[in-house]
Amino acid sequence: SPVPFGPEGRLEDKLHKPKATQTEVKPSVRFNLRTSKDPEHEGCYLSVGHSQPLEDCSFNMTAKTFFIIHGWTMSGIFENWLHKLVSALHTREKDANVVVVDWLPLAHQLYTDAVNNTRVVGHSIARMLDWLQEKDDFSLGNVHLIGYSLGAHVAGYAGNFVKGTVGRITGLDPAGPMFEGVDINRRLSPDDADFVDVLHTYTLSFGLSIGIRMPVGHIDIYPNGGDFQPGCGFNDVIGSFAYGTISEMVKCEHERAVHLFVDSLVNQDKPSFAFQCTDSSRFKRGICLSCRKNRCNNIGYNAKKMRKKRNSKMYLKTRAGMPFKVYHYQLKVHMFSYNNSGDTQPTLYITLYGSNADSQNLPLEIVEKIELNATNTFLVYTEEDLGDLLKMRLTWEGVAHSWYNLWNEFRNYLSQPSNPSRELYIRRIRVKSGETQRKVTFCTQDPTKSSISPGQELWFHKCQDGWKMKNKTSPFVNLA
C-alpha cells in the first residue's frame, strides 16, 4: 500500500508523492473531465495553470460544473456507483461539465490516514476552482460538488477553502467515524456552500455508524429513518447465505444515498418527497406529512434551495429499488372501547382502494402503543399511485401469523383472561396524502356497525367532513 500522508507539512509537499522510479512529479489529486457517458472513454485530465486541456476537451465555461468526489477505498479502483452517477449527470444536464476528482492515492489508505488527507484534497479542489474563476464566464454559483461518504467532507473543505461561495454541495451519506460531533470547520456544514443538502442512509443509532448521524446541511434527509434501507436486508443482499457478507449489507445501505440521487436525476417524472420532522419516531407515527411553511421538499438533485433552514431533518419512505418513489398517507383513526380493553394492541391492516389502483394489505405500524378512546395517527405508504381514494378496508388480524403476533395475543390473553371479547369501535378514518396534501374522511357505511374484533374487517367509504373541505389544491404544482 502507498505511504500515508499526514495532515502536517506544506500543501505542495502533500499534493505530490515523489518516487525514485518517477521521471516526473505526479499530483495525488487528479481532475478527470468526463467527456462521454461511456466509462471506457478516458476523458481529459485538467490541471491548474494548463488551459489547453480546457479547450481540447470543450470545457463549457458558462454551463453547470459538477465535481464528483469519491470516498475511502479499499480497492484502489472506482466503484460502479461513480460510473452510474457520471452517466446520470450527462443524461440530465447535457451541456454540463462533469469532473471526477480522483484522490485514490490518498484514499487508498488506512481509514484514519484517509481522513487526515481530506483537508489536503479539499484544498486541491479549491485551488482548481480558484484557477477556473480566473477564466471569463466561469461562475462559482454554477458549481455543484457531490461527495460520497468521506468525499462529502472533502467537498466541505473545498467549499470552505475556495475564494467565494460554491453554488451547492450534496453530501451522499457523509462519513461518520471521526466526523460525528466535531467542529463545523472539520466536517461538512451549511457554511460550505450557498446550499448544502444531505442524504443520510446508513446512520446506525447504536455502535459505530458508517454514515454521520448528525445533521450537517441546510436540509438533511433521512430516507427510511436513515438506517435500514429496503432491499438491503441480509436476505436481500445475499440472495443465499452461501455468497455474501455483512460488508455487502453495509455497502448496500451506505451506497443507497448515491442511488437515490441518481434516481432523482433520471426519473424526473417520479420525484420523491421528504417531510420535515423532529425525529424518525414521529415520522413513523405519521405526524409529519405537512408541506406548510416549506416543511416538505424534493430529494436529491431536484431539492429546492432552502437557505433559511439549517440542519432541518426531513424523512421519507422509499421502495427497495429504482424508481424509489412511494406515496405517503397519514391515517388518523379514533379508536373507542366500551369495555376498556386495557392493553389491547391490535394487529391492524388497511387496504386502500383508489381510482387508479388498489393497495396491498398495509400494516398499521404501532410505534409506541395504541391509545384507546383517543385519535391515533399512523403512516402508511404505497408503491403505486392509487389516484383518488374511494374506500378502504380495515382488518384486525385474528390468527397469529408470526411469533411476534402470537406473543401479542398471548400477552393480551394473560392481561384479560376474563374478557375474551376484545372489541374496538372506529367510526371514521381521516386520510391525508403527503404528495398531494389532500385530506379525505372515510366513515363506516352504517354508524351502528362500527365495531371490529380479531379476525374481522370493517369497510369505510368517503363521507363529508369539515376537514376535507379545507384543502383542495396540491402544493406540489410548483415543486414537481
Epitope: 505526479k26 495525488s28 484502489g76 461513480l82 460510473h83 485514490l104 487508498h108 440472495g239 455487502e248
Partner: antibody, heavy 120, light 107 residues
C-alpha cells in the same frame, strides 16, 4: 495500438519465487489499471488482483493475498507480479490485462500469457 | 464471491450456424457482464462489455443480452475463426469472477 508484452515461460522448483513482467505500450500507462489472471491447465480464469500504476495501490483476491505481490515501474511502463513459495498448484498460464478505472470496466487488452511450470 | 456458471462446457456447431452461449450469476450483477474469446493458442480478446456493448473491431455477428442474473452471447452466421472458448466475467463486485468457459467446436 495497445499492447501488453509478457515475459517468457518459466520452469521452477517448489519453494522458489518468480517475477513475471508485463510491458505496456500504445497508451498512457497511468490512466488504466493492470490486472493479473491465472488459468490452471484446462481450467477457467481466476482473478489474482490489480495494481493502479498511477500510485502503486494494489488489491488482491483474498485467495492470492500471501502468494502474489504486484508492483510497477512507471518509467518503463512495466507491471510485475512476483509469486512466492511455489508449489505444483501454481503451475498455470498467467495473464496480465488492462482495465479501465471502474469495477465494471472490462479487461479490454490482454498479454499473450506466461506459462509457469513448477516441478521438482 | 459471485459464482458465474456456464452450464454448457462444450458446444458443436457448423459454419453459418447461429449459436447462443449462456451464463448465470449467483446474484444480480446489474448488467456488468463481459464476454471474452480465447483461441487455442491462448490469445484472449474482449468481445462484449456491459452485457451488450461490442468492443471495437469485433464483428457485428457477435451480440450480447441479458439482465439480473441471466446473460447470453449470440454468434450468428458462424465463421471458422469463431471456433474457440468463450468466457463470461462479472464486473459488479470484487473479486472479479469468470465463468468456467464454453468451448465451441466445429461439428
Amino acid at each position: 495500438e495497445v499492447q501488453l508484452q509478457q515475459s517468457g515461460p518459466e520452469l521452477l522448483k517448489p519453494g522458489a519465487s518468480v517475477k513475471i513482467s508485463c510491458k505496456a505500450s500504445g497508451y498512457t500507462f497511468t490512466d488504466n489499471t493492470i490486472h493479473w489472471v491465472k488459468q490452471s491447465h484446462g481450467k477457467s480464469l481466476e482473478w489474482i488482483g490489480h495494481i493502479n500504476p498511477y500510485y502503486g495501490g494494489t488489491n488482491n483476491n483474498e485467495k492470492f493475498k500471501d502468494k502474489a505481490t504486484l508492483t510497477v515501474d512507471k518509467s518503463s511502463s512495466t507491471a510485475y507480479m512476483e509469486l512466492r513459495s511455489l508449489t505444483s498448484e501454481d503451475s498455470a498460464i498467467y495473464y496480465c490485462a488492462r482495465k479501465g478505472i471502474y469495477y465494471s470496466s472490462p479487461f479490454d487488452y490482454w498479454g499473450q500469457g506466461t506459462t509457469l511450470t513448477v516441478s521438482s | 464471491d459471485i459464482q458465474m456458471t456456464q452450464t454448457t462446457s462444450s458446444l458443436s456447431a457448423s459454419l453459418g450456424d447461429r449459436v447462443t452461449i449462456s451464463c448465470r450469476a449467483s446474484q444480480d450483477i446489474n448488467n456488468y457482464l463481459n464476454w471474452y474469446q480465447q483461441k487455442p493458442d491462448g490469445t484472449v480478446k474482449l468481445l462484449i462489455s456491459y452485457t451488450s456493448k461490442l468492443h471495437s473491431g469485433v464483428p457485428s455477428r457477435f451480440s450480447g443480452s441479458g439482465s439480473g442474473t441471466d446473460y447470453s452471447l449470440t454468434i450468428s452466421n458462424l465463421e471458422r475463426e469463431d471456433f474457440a472458448t468463450y468466457f463470461c466475467q462479472q464486473g459488479n463486485t470484487l473479486p472479479f469472477t469468470f465463468g468456467s468457459g464454453t468451448n465451441l467446436e466445429i461439428k
